[in-house]
């Protein structure tokens, strides 16, 4: 059967800081999260079956003034979807997206979402992971911050 | 045959107000809009065949100063793609996206688009609908504001 | 076999100016770029096989103050994915997205990404192309600026 995964953010373990970090805590079996013929391990989505896959990610950032004061109004809110090959230890960014934002204290609430998607050849054993900037601003809802993949066709 | 739908906004019947509303008027059979083995009824896209589907939405907001004066520069421009189960009357958000925006009167034109997409298990009889904030700012073009789904695989 | 393409920007030949232009230089056979049972010619992705396709594009814009001074802080950063039919010489926009942005000189770096995607009926011989505003601001990375398509199903 065709492999797929839809992984939603596990907000109980989101890193802090403003620099780029890899997000390692995702749900794979609750709510909208699900996985079949792929493996989720150590924060990475592992390919078990060669093929061409459509990969996607939706990342939401938000801040309410009651959460505290931002260190800077000028933010880089970014996502990077990366592929790591174990055989040849290397990591490459498949897709990136995001925006620089000016989140002023004049507004009590700020929100921003990024969506990226693309069609990629993946080999068994390769691993997909998601990196973001400003992880402490992530929206923890399952409808907000997630990534996934589904196999579309075999490699000829 | 594999079900699909691509529904484009019917701008002759867009609600007003700034709060979140469900968009019920969509085209399903003109221009780029089309549907097969799914049903469009009462503003909702109804699933006729169990399966895993890729769902997507593209929502564009725009304002020209000639359209009138905005009540606030601080806008929440959001989309929510929701699933309703008739058997168990409940509605859940599958995907959300958007941004807070500062649309100043100092600029004559403003534009912003949101895209969301994800892979979900849908059962026959379940309904997909789209909610947005600030519907009166929607771009009425068929290339701008649309949502859709296509079945990728059966449920094992 | 099911057709697909994932084309990444060829930054050696990006047009200048701020007006809408068609992007004609894309890679189809290096890095993440690939194509099968479709043709890339004269800056357009040509359909060789009738079917329903999922089309997508990810477009990143960026500016660093070291690159020079912008002519205006008020930018329209847009993408248009268009279909051209040779038999009936006409071009139609399938998908559009983007945002107006205020890129002030107070910040040394600016970034913004657009993602669009949708499901369309394509006939053999039809051509897909991508137009953007402000092409000189495009991010030239293969993970940043790309578009693609994959066939999902036949036309009944």
């Amino acid at each position: 059967a065709q492999p797929f995964a839809h992984l939603t953010i596990n907000a109980t373990n989101i890193p802090t800081g403003s620099h780029k970090v890899s997000l390692s805590s995702w749900y794979h079996d609750r709510g909208w999260a699900k996985i079949s013929n792929m493996t989720f391990s150590n924060g990475k989505l592992i390919v078990n079956q060669d093929g061409f896959y459509y990969l996607y990610a939706n990342i939401c950032f938000r801040h309410h003034e009651t959460s505290g004061d931002l260190a800077t109004e000028y933010l880089q809110l970014m996502v990077y979807v990366t592929k790591t090959s174990i055989k040849i230890p290397s990591s490459h960014t498949l897709m990136k997206g995001g925006s620089t934002k000016y989140w002023s204290g004049n507004s009590e609430f700020h929100f921003y979402s990024i969506n990226v998607g693309g069609f990629f050849k993946l080999r068994s054993g390769e691993e997909i992971s998601v990196e973001v900037s400003n992880p402490s601003l992530l929206d923890p809802d399952q409808d907000a911050t997630y990534f996934g993949a589904f196999k579309v066709r075999d490699i000829d | 045959a594999q079900p699909f739908a691509h529904l484009t906004i019917n701008a002759t019947n867009i609600p007003t107000g700034s709060h979140k509303v469900s968009l019920s008027s969509w085209y399903h059979d003109r221009g780029w809009a089309k549907i097969s083995n799914m049903t469009f009824s009462n503003g909702k896209l109804i699933v006729n065949q169990d399966g895993f589907y890729y769902l997507y939405a593209n929502i564009c907001f725009r304002h020209h100063e000639t359209s009138g004066d905005l009540a606030t520069e601080y806008l929440q421009l959001m989309v929510y793609v929701t699933k309703t189960s008739i058997k168990i009357p409940s509605s859940h958000t599958l995907m959300k996206g958007g941004s807070t925006k500062y649309w100043s009167g100092n600029s004559e034109f403003h534009f912003y688009s949101i895209n969301v997409g994800g892979f979900f298990k849908l059962r026959s009889g379940e309904e997909i609908s789209v909610e947005v904030s600030n519907p009166s700012l929607l771009d009425p073009d068929q290339d701008a504001t649309y949502f859709g789904a296509f079945k990728v695989r059966d449920i094992d | 076999a099911q057709p697909f393409a994932h084309l990444t920007i060829n930054a050696t030949n990006i047009p200048t100016g701020s007006h809408k232009v068609s992007l004609s230089s894309w890679y189809h056979d290096r890095g993440w770029a690939k194509i099968s049972n479709m043709t890339f010619s004269n800056g357009k992705l040509i359909v060789n096989q009738d079917g329903f396709y999922y089309l997508y594009a990810n477009i990143c814009f960026r500016h660093h103050e070291t690159s020079g001074d912008l002519a205006t802080e008020y930018l329209q950063l847009m993408v248009y994915v268009t279909k051209t039919s040779i038999k009936i010489p006409s071009s139609h926009t399938l998908m559009k997205g983007g945002s107006t942005k205020y890129w002030s000189g107070n910040s040394e770096f600016h970034f913004y990404s657009i993602n669009v995607g949708g499901f369309f009926k394509l006939r053999s011989g039809e051509e897909i192309s991508v137009e953007v505003s402000n092409p000189s601001l495009l991010d030239p990375d293969q993970d940043a600026t790309y578009f693609g398509a994959f066939k999902v199903r036949d036309i009944d």
């Epitope: - | 007003t16 700034s18 359209s67 009540a71 606030t72 601080y74 | -």
Partner: nanobody, 126 residues
Framework: EVQLVESGGGLVQAGGSLRLSCAAA????????MGWFRQAPGKEREFVTA????????GYVDSVKDRFTISRDNTKNTVYLQMASLKPEDTAVYYC???????????????????WGQGTQVTVSS
């Protein structure tokens, strides 16, 4: 709960100017759309002008365009109405009004405003 107090009204000759002020207390002023309405003797209260929460969007009734200017100072919780080239038909009680933005565009009807001041009299003599 927002309390609104108008000031600056009075008697002025035709062609003259006046500046009305409306001070707000309670609530977060920057979150409110502010408007001015007026009621002439024996007539219904009518919309004059409104200003967006941040002050960059303004709307006016046609009869006062290019003569009246609405502005606001969110640091002082105050909205102003500068009135120039006054005419006898501008004679009315002027009311300040406030509402949170429930509509995308500036509200122009009385029922869309939640809070009202007591009014200040403007009389333009010929």
């Amino acid at each position: 709960e927002v309390q609104l107090v108008e000031s600056g009204g009075g008697l002025v000759q035709a062609g003259g100017s006046l500046r009305l002020s409306c001070a707000a207390a309670g609530g977060t002023f920057r979150n409110y759309v502010m408007g001015w309405f007026r009621q002439a003797p024996g007539k219904e209260r009518e919309f004059v002008t409104a200003i967006s929460t941040g002050g960059s969007w303004t709307g006016y009734v046609d009869s006062v365009k290019d003569r009246f200017t609405i502005s606001r100072d969110n640091t002082k919780n105050t909205v102003y109405l500068q009135m120039a080239s006054l005419k006898p038909e501008d004679t009315a009680v002027y009311y300040c009004a406030a509402t949170t933005p429930a509509t995308t565009y500036l509200p122009r009807s009385e029922r869309q405003y939640d809070y009202w001041g007591q009014g200040t009299q403007v009389t333009v003599s010929s």
